[in-house]
């Protein structure tokens, strides 16, 4: 089990951390949905894409993302979502060669085609929250999380640890 800790506890660790090696410690294929059970879906072409937050039809298959889990090298003494004092980070890929990226200037979540090693913008600290929910905090901008805004994904600033449980930054992972 992972604990919940305040956003600010991660600030130094995030800025100082680097990803151990180039290989993830594990990978997991899962559908991504919001706290309110709307699905995250992707419409992706070579030169364009859309990311939707929507209700799916009964017969429609859910889109899946490949979550690759990495440990950061920075050992943290604070209680956090880590293993053996290390933070757990993830990258999210809906298909081969494409990854979710944080665009902190535009406060947007984008899909980029890129080669490994991935840039820091593709890494998110994984927080395990209540009710089997998770949240994704930008490695490049501590305190900023992937969230839902106007039926799209966006980057949302969370000012205090109390707001870590706000519904619009909570997501559910499911194998189905």
């Amino acid at each position: 089990a992972f604990g919940i800790s305040g956003v600010q506890k991660y600030t130094r660790a995030l800025h100082d951390s680097s990803i151990t090696g180039i290989s993830p410690i594990t990978e997991y294929l899962a559908s991504l949905s919001t706290y309110n059970d709307q699905s995250i879906t992707f419409a992706l072409e070579d030169e364009s894409y859309e990311i939707y937050v929507e209700d799916l039809k009964k017969d429609e298959k859910k889109d899946k993302v490949l979550l690759s889990y990495y440990e950061s090298q920075h050992p943290s003494n604070e209680s956090g979502d880590g293993v053996d004092g290390k933070m757990l980070m993830v990258t999210l890929s809906p298909t081969k060669d494409f990854w979710l990226h944080a665009n902190n200037k535009e406060h947007s979540v984008e899909l980029h085609k890129c080669e490994k090693p991935l840039p820091d913008q593709a890494f998110f600290v994984l927080h395990n929250m209540h009710s089997n929910c998770v949240s994704f905090e930008c490695k490049t901008d501590p305190g900023v999380f992937i969230g839902v805004k106007d039926n799209h994904l966006a980057l949302i600033k969370v000012d205090s640890s109390e707001n870590l449980c706000t519904e619009n930054i909570l997501f559910k992972l499911s194998e189905t």
Epitope: F42, A43, K57, K58, T95
Partner: antibody, heavy 128, light 106 residues
């Protein structure tokens, strides 16, 4: 610009074989599921076969009417889709279209997207 | 196997609205796509996911889908809209087309 160019059609006797090709350009061929759709003269569209993109392992799918006789395949290095047609019957006479999914196939996505791009078709006539 | 049923023909006067139906069991639980095909040409996608239009398709084309019926609506029909129209869904990894509807602009 997305382009799909079919070739390989022609006249063949019942029981014979043909291999259709679809040369693709203007997009990352390996990322998309591809299909063959046919249209008999004066008739409607009929889905024939499809093959996944590399997001879903390149698995083939077939309509019941061609299962066991037709084989779909792809060569991603050549950006080419194929349809090997054996034991051809008169009812296989049709224009055969190559079609690309509207979007890139996602991990484990299966077949679910519409056909966003179509080739011009190649005519296959099965007759003695 | 899954069956989609369309009316063979629909006639409409220029400027009027043409509605083409596509019926199938629990159709509303699936996403419907619509294709336009003019004589001697390849099909063109005009509606996908029930209601969405690809870029380049005029706004007069719209779609809906609920219950057992999907509908393609052409508002302010023009002479250039005269064509065959096909609905399509995926059912258990099998592509299924309707029989097609010939739209005649009188």
């Amino acid at each position: 610009e997305v382009q799909l160019l079919e070739s390989g059609g022609g006249l063949v006797q019942p029981g014979g074989s043909l291999r259709l090709s679809c040369a693709a350009s203007g997009f990352t061929f390996s990322s998309y599921a591809m299909s063959w759709v046919r249209q008999a003269p004066g008739k409607g569209l009929e889905w024939v076969s499809a093959i996944n993109g590399d997001g879903d392992g390149g698995r083939p799918y077939y309509a019941d009417s061609v299962k066991g006789r037709f084989t779909i395949s792809r060569d991603n290095s050549k950006n080419t889709l194929y349809l090997q047609m054996n034991s051809l019957r008169a009812e296989d006479t049709a224009v055969y279209y190559c079609a690309r999914d509207l979007w890139i196939q996602l991990w484990g996505g299966g077949l679910r997207y519409p056909f966003g791009y179509w080739g011009q078709g190649t005519m296959v006539t099965v007759s003695s | 196997s899954y069956v989609l049923t369309q009316p063979p023909s629909v006639s409409v006067s220029p400027g009027q609205t043409a509605s083409i139906t596509c019926s199938g069991e629990r159709m509303g639980d699936k996403y419907a796509a619509w294709y336009q095909q003019k004589p001697g040409q390849s099909p063109v996608l005009v509606i996908y996911q029930d209601t969405k239009r690809p870029s380049g398709i005029p706004e007069r084309f719209s779609g809906s889908n609920s219950g057992n019926t999907a509908t393609l609506t052409i508002s302010g029909t023009q002479a250039m809209d005269e064509a065959d129209y096909y609905c399509q869904v995926w059912d258990s990894s099998t592509g299924v087309f309707g029989g097609g509807t010939k739209v005649t602009v009188l």
